[in-house]
């Protein structure tokens, strides 16, 4: 059976939205109006992965991008990047260990734990126009929360 | 220091079934980021990835042999399996036993090997 | 599957030689590529990983460079214990694929 996607967007808890910074890079700022057209679109795959009521294994693919979020060790440091992939493979049930994410619901409010970096999360900055980078910590001064908006395909 | 011995390997008939075993000390199956996995070559051969597990239990095999081996690890006695069925001439080969850090992944430290034999 | 080739597939040289494998993919890995030395009636060992990063224990003279799907390993200056056969490993996508191998034999 295919994988199952959906499109969506995502905000921090401080509703900064998230855009692309170069071509390999996201960051995260408050728009409003038009410039909300420039945030990214996620196609979210439902894979394979341990799965419990508030825990489910995902993928984060730009929409209609050959371009998915994953977690590697650079310089000895978990780190989030944006990796390129054939668009003829992808999406697919089986991911590789370091495209997948756990999508954690929390009180309405969403984390992205990576699936190879157990307690590393998807995070951004309180200060505007940052990358987007995987985090070690939660509660502390960097932001781990994230709302999704669905988007119709 | 990392070791991984493998056993289990012998003479078999076609269409019958072994499991290997790999024994693994100097670390642990279930460390955080910790993958074994299974490589095999056939005599006079190259080498070809059979199967891996995380020490989450996220399991990956090669699509050529999925239906047929099964990976497995038993945490308590920091052990690796590999249970083959329905074997053929073509399975015939050493099989190693080989340890990564996360993916992608490169394998570290390999097991000495153990010879499969499948003949009638 | 990605397919790897590995070139040559059969090498002869001489102590003191500098030698080029190529393993080229059959479509973009990054740099998710590790090489491997084989010994008859041994275990592979792990050389280079991420493309270019020396194993820890390995001498200098092994280097590895290049990245998308042509990758190349070097030995600046051959030593009789580098007569081995050399793998090469794809780790951008599952199922993980090695090259068919490079033997590299005395002159």
């Known amino acids: 059976a295919p994988v199952r996607s959906l499109n969506c967007t995502l905000r921090d808890s401080q509703q900064k939205s998230l855009v692309m910074s170069g071509p390999y890079e996201l960051k995260a700022l408050h728009l409003q109006g038009q410039d909300m057209e420039q945030q990214v679109v996620f196609s979210m795959s439902f894979v394979q992965g341990e799965e419990s009521n508030d825990k489910i294994p995902v993928a984060l693919g730009l929409k209609e991008k050959n371009l998915y979020l994953s977690c590697v060790l650079k310089d000895d440091k978990p780190t989030l990047q944006l990796e390129s992939v054939d668009p003829k493979n992808y999406p697919k049930k089986k991911m590789e260990k370091r495209f997948v994410f756990n999508k954690i619901e929390i009180n309405n409010k969403l984390e992205f734990e990576s699936a190879q970096f157990p307690n590393w999360y998807i995070s951004t900055s309180q200060a505007e126009n940052m990358p987007v980078f995987l985090g070690g910590t939660k509660g502390g001064q960097d932001i781990t929360d994230f709302t999704m908006q669905f988007v119709s395909s | 220091e990392v070791q991984l011995v493998e056993s289990g390997g012998g003479l078999v008939q076609p269409g019958g079934s072994l499991r290997l075993s790999c024994a693994a000390s100097?670390?642990?199956?279930?460390?955080?980021?910790?993958?074994v996995g299974w490589v095999r070559q056939a005599p006079g051969k190259g080498l070809e990835w059979v199967s891996h597990?995380?020490?989450?239990?996220?399991?990956s095999y090669n699509p050529s042999l999925k239906s047929r081996f099964t990976i497995s690890r038993d945490n308590s006695k920091n052990t690796l399996y590999l249970q083959m069925n329905s074997l053929r001439a073509e399975d015939t080969a050493v099989y190693y036993c080989?340890?990564?850090?996360?993916?992608?992944?490169?394998?570290?430290?390999w097991g000495q090997g153990t010879l499969v034999t499948v003949s009638s | 599957e990605i397919v790897m080739t590995q070139s040559p597939s059969t090498l002869s040289a001489s102590v003191g030689d500098r030698v080029i494998i190529t393993c080229r993919a059959s479509?973009?890995?990054?740099?998710?590529l590790s090489w491997y030395q084989q010994k008859p009636g041994k275990a592979p060992k792990l050389l280079i990983y991420?493309?270019?990063k020396l194993h820890s224990g390995v001498p200098s003279r092994f280097s590895g460079s290049g990245s998308g799907a042509e990758f190349t390993l070097t030995i600046s200056s051959l030593q009789p214990d580098d007569f081995a056969t050399y793998y090469c490993l794809q780790g951008k996508m599952l199922p993980w694929t090695f090259g068919q191998g490079t033997k590299l034999t005395v002159l």
């Open positions: 080989a340890k990564n850090r996360y993916d992608p992944p490169w394998f570290v430290d």
């Open positions: 597990i995380w020490w989450d239990g996220d399991e």
């Open positions: 100097g670390f642990s199956l279930s460390t955080s980021g910790m993958g």
């Open positions: 991420y493309t270019s």
């Open positions: 479509q973009d890995i990054s740099n998710y």
